[in-house]
């Protein structure tokens, strides 16, 4: 069963800065990746970035830098200020589409143990609630 993992990390040096990493564990090639916050895109969530392997990357504030890490994983840096700033319990979702087979997604948020005043966890565990 294809799975998606999501990791969320708050940068210790910039308390309003988050790094979201997502990966696809399926065997198919990725056609499109959508990253959203506040819930899944289309279910109350707001799109932060869309990554297409050929057409490139599109991102919206407060997303600062979205990029492919590998052929099946991406990362996104968020930098917020004021109303658009993410908070510690913000949910981030990644949806990987492998056309025409289907789409798989998962959501995650900052691990409860993360203390913004201390160093951010170097390798937060992927969340298990993945479809």
């Amino acid at each position: 069963t294809p799975e998606v993992w999501v990791q969320v990390r708050m940068e210790a040096t910039e308390l309003s800065s988050f790094t979201i990493r997502c990966g696809f564990l399926g065997s198919g090639s990725i056609s499109l990746v959508t990253v959203s916050w506040g819930g899944p895109n289309g279910a109350g969530g707001t799109t932060l970035a869309v990554l297409h392997p050929e057409r490139g990357i599109r991102q919206w504030a407060p997303a600062r830098q979205a990029r492919w890490e590998t052929q099946s994983s991406i990362s996104l840096i968020l930098e917020g200020s004021g109303a658009s700033s993410p908070c510690a319990n913000t949910t981030f979702c990644c949806k990987f589409a492998s056309f025409p087979e289907g789409s798989w997604e998962a959501c995650g948020s900052l691990p409860p143990s993360s203390d913004p005043g201390l160093s951010a966890p170097p390798t937060p565990a992927p969340i298990l609630r993945a479809d």
Partner: antibody, heavy 115, light 107 residues
Framework: EVQLVESGGGLVKPGGSLRLSCAAS????????LSWVRQAPGKGLEWVSE????????YYPDTVTGRFTISRDNAKNTLYLQMSSLRAEDTAVYYC????????WGQGTLVTVSS | DIQMTQSPSSLSASVGDRVTITCKAS??????VAWYQQKPGKAPKLLIY???YRFTGVPSRFSGSGSGTDFTLTISSLQPEDFATYYC?????????FGGGTKVEIK
Amino acid sequence: EVQLVESGGGLVKPGGSLRLSCAASGFTFSSYGLSWVRQAPGKGLEWVSEISSGGTYTYYPDTVTGRFTISRDNAKNTLYLQMSSLRAEDTAVYYCARGDPFGYWGQGTLVTVSS
Amino acid sequence: DIQMTQSPSSLSASVGDRVTITCKASQDVMTAVAWYQQKPGKAPKLLIYSTSYRFTGVPSRFSGSGSGTDFTLTISSLQPEDFATYYCQQHYSTPRTFGGGTKVEIK
């Protein structure tokens, strides 16, 4: 061979409820997101809902939000659409479909909302 | 929501003709557009996905092109079994949206 078979359609009065089912076979059901798409008589296609492979995430257009609920039973290889507060404009053939986009479709089941 | 505007709504053509149907998205959908064929009383069938990829078993006379907001389905040499209604659909974001359809009739 991928097969999707819808059932549960019929005549219902405005304000009534109905539950559609879609029995799937020929593929690993729990690995795929599924959707419902409808088509009013003589009209075009309208996407109605989507559910992720594990059932965690669901999506609806504004036209049915709060009235329709999509669900699935991966143990039974069955997709459901619970429809309530039905209106005349919900009259349509309802298809279940697999994939993104919709590579496989059922034959459809007709829902008629009329007094 | 992304609107998909399809044209023409209907056309008449003869066997062997080259037929072109266009679809315009209200915003950039990259290459995430699919095309379906539907015959009366039947479920739609996926022909093309991601703008230009033919789905399993689809004849090579069907092709798709475009990107961004403008997309085209071409039937290079119309066959008797191709007389049907064709729909475009964006599979870029939710809600999924379809064009209004193009009915291809016999001239």
